[in-house]
């Protein structure tokens, strides 16, 4: 069977690791150095993708994979396959074209990456701002306004401390 | 150039094994990725098993399970173990290197 098949198409039968090559009346040929083909049938093997500069390699290459990168420290992937590395910038920053800029009041970053979004509008949701929001940290809503009236609290109140040295009685 | 010269074909029967060997010479720096092909009268040469350049051994499907090919580097060979032979594996095989070929060993594989 496989005799028959590589007759009608001789390339068909090339697997993962090699490409069909002309040069060679289409025998399958197994991948020059530093190259890949990562699925059968294929016509030429990929170059190896270099981790270099910035990239640091996460997965060496193989005859059937292409390497794979990450980001040195102080940097994170962007892209499909970490095809960019980016500048970290520390929480409560955000990278602009002159480099990490603080975020504006009223603003958040939580994270080493990313853009500063504004803190929560609590009271959209009828709702407090129960703690006050910082350039790294959005707010923290609360119960609303209403909750907070006389009677409405469903915790309950704390008992009286005792005073020292009276038993009780 | 590397020179390539194949032994270890023969006569043997159905469930049988026979061990190639694949001896290098020459300019063996460039013998990163090697190979055993086979090839029956009239027929296209095929791709049996190789050891790629990131020193990995590879088989096509009809080889799997059967077939073993390793290299000693202090002997400059490389050998393909085949074990569980079949009437369908009789062939030559020759060894290979970039453009470097043996010049074939007969395995006949007959009761």
């Known amino acids: 069977f496989e005799r028959t098949r590589s007759l009608q198409d001789p390339c068909s039968n090339c697997p993962a690791g090699t490409f069909c090559d002309n040069n060679r009346n289409q025998i399958c040929s197994p991948c020059p150095p530093n190259s890949f083909s990562s699925a059968g049938g294929q016509r030429t093997c990929d170059i190896c993708r270099q981790c270099k500069g910035v990239f640091r390699t996460r997965k060496e290459c193989s005859s059937t994979s292409n390497a794979e990168c990450d980001c040195t420290p102080g940097f994170h992937c962007l892209g499909a396959g970490c095809s960019m590395c980016e500048q970290d910038c520390k929480q409560g920053q955000e990278l602009t074209k002159k480099g990490c800029k603080d975020c504006c009041f009223g603003t958040f970053n939580d994270q080493k990456r990313g853009i500063c979004r504004p803190w929560t509008n609590c009271s959209l949701d009828g709702k407090s701002v129960l703690v006050n929001g910082t350039k790294e940290r959005d707010v923290v809503c609360g119960p609303s306004p209403a909750d907070l009236s006389p009677g409405a609290s469903s915790v309950t109140p704390p008992a009286p401390a005792r005073e020292p040295g009276h038993s009780p009685q | 150039a590397v020179q390539l010269v194949e032994s270890g074909g023969g006569l043997v029967q159905p469930g049988g094994s026979l061990r190639l060997s694949c001896a290098a010479s020459g300019n063996i720096s460039s013998l990163r990725v090697i190979a055993w092909y086979r090839q029956g009268p009239g027929k296209q040469r095929e791709l049996v098993a190789w050891i790629a350049w990131d020193d990995i051994a590879h088989y096509v499907d009809s080889a799997k399970g059967r077939f073993a090919i390793w290299r000693d580097n202090t002997k400059k060979t490389t050998y393909l173990q085949m074990n569980s032979l079949k009437l369908e594996d009789t062939d030559v095989y020759y060894c290979?290197?970039?453009?470097?070929w043996g010049q074939g060993t007969q395995v006949t594989v007959s009761s």
């Open positions: 290979n290197s970039g453009d470097s």
